[in-house]
Each structure stands twice: as structure tokens, then as C-alpha cells.
């Protein structure tokens, strides 16, 4: 996925990674010996964050618009290495595929497992959260699942806006040239839904819909 | 150690609102479900609402929904409970209390003190 | 919904001695996982219920040993070995199966 290319553009930055950035560095002039406890840093960011009105939060936005207009310029003109024809273009204004139930609930309770046993692996981590999925009476999961629901319908209306607009010209021409079998196609179509939930997991949750579903 | 404290009870009448309000401290807020529990002058208890950690996903019983709003401020470390068009009938004493869920089988572990709703002309 | 019975409604107990309350479910508490979707909680006078027994068996922290929770499906019983003037009070079951539903309550209450 142009991992070790150098030449790939540089993933864009979200306003709350700004902000975060900032903190770094007004920290570093504050402070340029002392040695950063990285989740009591990342605590503090995220309550200063919380408690920044609109027009403060201002600032980071336009930077984060900036680098999204400057990710998008140098990915039209950006051509993976041989090697990587395998995957392909993603537009970054194309719909974001809708997280799952299973996977919203992991996105209340990852931080709990995490904070709970410091030393875990990903893995570890993740196999507490699906015991705990497997462990939640129906009734429990059905707001997840309610939720999931209210996602994806909005996705499918989305994509569907979308894909009657037209793709952008690079995504035509398309980076993969050959004519997938169904079952290859369906199999990146997974690969790539995976990819997204990695994505969303990665991004601060700043602007978390708060939508109350009632059971 | 964990501590839950309720406010905002008091008399109101038949068709008012109270919002309740209940402090959390001594662990990580934002990483619990909550929820409000109440029980009526020498009645037994009953499940009121419940809220997830992000506050995202709220959940009531049909005795409330439409009228009771259950919502979270984690970086104050607050649960709430707007109550609209009370009844006579919601008059009790309201707890909040945290759910620990023990991979995923959930119980209210802690407790608050409690504070008393009375909907009265 | 899950209705939730509790017997009998007031129990007259000697300090010392055995006592026991029952809950049935209108319907099983049983989980696919094989644990039971029950807690009990103890609520003295004067004061905020607090956690007993969750899971149908498991003591809460700090618990004393002469409590012990028993059962499965859709009857528990909640067992004192002897009881101590300090359990006195109102006890609920609980079930989190559906939604969250309690028992009316026994009162214990010393003899």
C-alpha cells in the first residue's frame, strides 16, 4: 500500500491531530528536558479539546482543510510504484464505509481494556473486546445494532449520491487496469473494509455523532 | 476511592421539569456505562436509563421514554437526567450507579446516596 | 419483559441462624455462554442499595463469605449461613438479560 514509498503523499491531518501537535510543541518550549507520559499527555489534550469553543478549534480546522485540499492535489498526481498496482484508488471524498455493531461497541469499551491493562497487544486487546461482544446479552447489543443500521442506510444513500455524481477522472482511469474475477473483487471489497475500521480507529473521535437511539 | 453523588432533586409540579445531576470520582468516568435507577417512597427499584461511555447510545424504560433524557459530560465527570412533563408517579428516589461490566456481564457495582423527586400540585 | 418473583416478601431471621430468598424469572436467565444474567443487591435502611452476588454466584467485592448466590435458568436463591444483625435490610434480585428488571424485594428483618 506505497508504505515504503517515499514519494507517496502524506497522509492528511485531522484538526484534533493539529491541535495535538501544537500541545506537543508548546510542551517541548516549556518543558525541553523533561521526558512526556504519553496517556496523561493525550488526557489532557483531549479535555483541553473538549472545552475549546468553536471559534478556537477554528484555527485547527482550517488547517486541517489546507492539508486535506493539499493530500487530495498530490494524490491525483501521485503513481504507486510497480509493485503496488494491487490496490486501488481511493477517493478521499468517497463515503466512508459504515462501522459495524461489534465495531462501535469496541469503540466505547477499547479505551476501558486499554487503560485497564496498560501492557496488552492489539490483539490481546481486541480478543478481550470480542469476548466481552460474546459475553453481551442480545438485548444489550441491539443498540449497536440499531445504530450500525442507521449508518449503513446513510452510507448506501451516500455512495449512491456518489457514484451518480461520477467518480473523479484518476479513479476512471483507474489503477487497476485488469478486469477482476467477482470473487477477487469481492475479496478486496473486504480487505478494504477492514482498512477503514483500522482508519476510523486510528481517528480522534472529536466529532462523534451523538446520536441517542433509543432501544 | 469511588464516589457518586447526586443533586438537583426536589418538589415540582405535575406537567415541570428537574434536571438531575450526579458527580463521579475516584475512577475513570468516561470509560463506564451509567445508569438511573429509582424507587418510590416504600416501593422496590426500578431501572430508569442507561447511557454508554461516549454518551453515543442511550437507552430507557418505556415508563420515561419521550420524556426523560439521559446524557454525560465526561469531561466534567457528570451523568444527567432531564425529566420533563413529570407525573405524580415519578416521584421517588432517583440513584445513579455505575455499571461494571465483567467481560461484558453487566452490574451496578457502586452506588450513589440518592436524591428525592417529589411531583406534586 | 422479564418479570421477576421474589419469596417470601418478609423474612423474621435469628441472629446466628440460616436464611434463605428465592427468584424465579418468567424466563431463563441462562445466557448462550453458560452464565446466568442475575445479580443481587442488599439495600439497608436508610441507605443506597449496594452489589451482593452478580452473575447468579459470583460475591462482589467485600462481600462477606456467608453469602453465597445458587441456581440457574429461572430459580435462584440467595443463602445467608448465618445471618448477622448488620443484614438486615430489603433484597432484590436482578436480571440484565433484557433490559433490567427487579424483584419486589424481601425484607429481612431480626426476630
Known amino acids: 500500500m506505497g508504505k515504503g514509498d517515499p514519494k507517496k503523499p502524506r497522509g492528511k491531518m485531522s484538526s484534533y491531530a493539529f491541535f495535538v501537535q501544537t500541545c506537543r510543541e508548546e510542551h517541548k518550549k516549556k518543558h525541553p528536558d523533561a521526558s512526556v507520559n504519553f496517556s496523561e499527555f493525550s488526557k489532557k489534550c483531549s479535555e483541553r479539546w473538549k472545552t475549546m469553543s468553536a471559534k478556537e478549534k477554528g484555527k485547527f480546522e482550517d488547517m486541517a482543510k489546507a492539508d486535506k485540499a493539499r493530500y487530495e492535489r498530490e494524490m491525483k498526481t501521485y503513481i504507486p510504484p510497480k509493485g503496488e498496482t494491487k490496490k486501488k484508488f481511493k477517493d478521499p471524498n468517497a463515503p466512508k464505509r459504515p462501522p459495524s455493531a461489534f465495531f462501535l461497541f469496541c469503540s466505547e469499551y477499547r479505551p476501558k481494556i486499554k487503560g485497564e491493562h496498560p501492557g496488552l497487544s492489539i490483539g490481546d486487546v481486541a480478543k478481550k473486546l470480542g469476548e466481552m461482544w460474546n459475553n453481551t446479552a442480545a438485548d444489550d447489543k441491539q443498540p449497536y445494532e440499531k445504530k450500525a443500521a442507521k449508518l449503513k442506510e446513510k452510507y448506501e444513500k451516500d455512495i449512491a449520491a456518489y457514484r451518480a455524481k461520477g467518480k473523479p477522472d484518476a479513479a476512471k482511469k483507474g489503477v487497476v487496469k485488469a478486469e477482476k474475477s467477482k470473487k477477487k473483487k469481492e475479496e478486496e471489497e473486504d480487505e478494504e473494509d477492514e482498512e477503514d475500521e483500522e482508519e476510523e480507529e486510528d481517528e480522534e473521535d472529536e466529532d462523534e455523532e451523538e446520536d441517542d437511539d433509543d432501544e | 476511592e469511588v464516589q457518586l453523588l447526586e443533586s438537583g432533586g426536589g418538589l415540582v409540579q405535575p406537567g415541570g421539569s428537574l434536571r438531575l445531576s450526579c458527580a463521579a470520582s475516584g475512577f475513570t468516568f468516561s470509560w463506564y456505562k451509567m445508569v438511573w435507577v429509582r424507587q418510590a417512597p416504600g416501593k422496590g427499584l426500578e431501572w430508569v436509563s442507561s447511557i454508554v461511555p461516549s454518551g453515543g447510545i442511550t437507552i430507557y424504560a418505556d415508563s420515561v421514554k419521550g420524556r426523560f433524557t439521559i446524557s454525560r459530560d465526561n469531561s466534567k465527570n457528570t451523568l444527567y437526567l432531564q425529566m420533563n412533563s413529570l407525573r405524580a408517579e415519578d416521584t421517588a428516589v432517583y440513584y445513579c450507579?455505575?455499571?461494571?461490566?465483567?467481560?461484558?456481564?453487566?452490574?451496578?457495582?457502586?452506588w450513589g446516596q440518592g436524591t428525592l423527586v417529589t411531583v406534586s400540585s | 419483559d422479564i418479570q421477576m418473583t421474589q419469596s417470601p416478601l418478609s423474612l423474621p431471621v435469628t441472629p446466628g441462624e440460616p436464611a434463605s430468598i428465592s427468584c424465579r424469572s418468567s424466563q431463563s436467565l441462562l445466557h448462550g455462554n453458560g452464565y446466568n444474567y442475575l445479580d443481587w443487591y442488599l439495600q439497608r435502611p436508610g441507605q443506597s442499595p449496594q452489589l451482593l452476588i452478580y452473575?447468579?454466584?459470583n460475591r462482589a467485592s467485600g462481600v462477606p463469605d456467608r453469602f453465597s448466590g445458587s441456581g440457574s435458568g429461572t430459580d435462584f436463591t440467595l443463602k445467608i449461613s448465618r445471618v448477622e444483625a448488620e443484614d438486615v435490610g430489603v433484597y432484590y434480585c436482578m436480571q440484565s438479560l433484557q433490559s433490567r428488571t427487579f424483584g419486589q424485594g424481601t425484607k429481612v428483618e431480626i426476630k
Open positions: 450507579a455505575r455499571v461494571q461490566q465483567w467481560l461484558g456481564r453487566p452490574y451496578f457495582d457502586y
Open positions: 452473575s447468579g454466584s
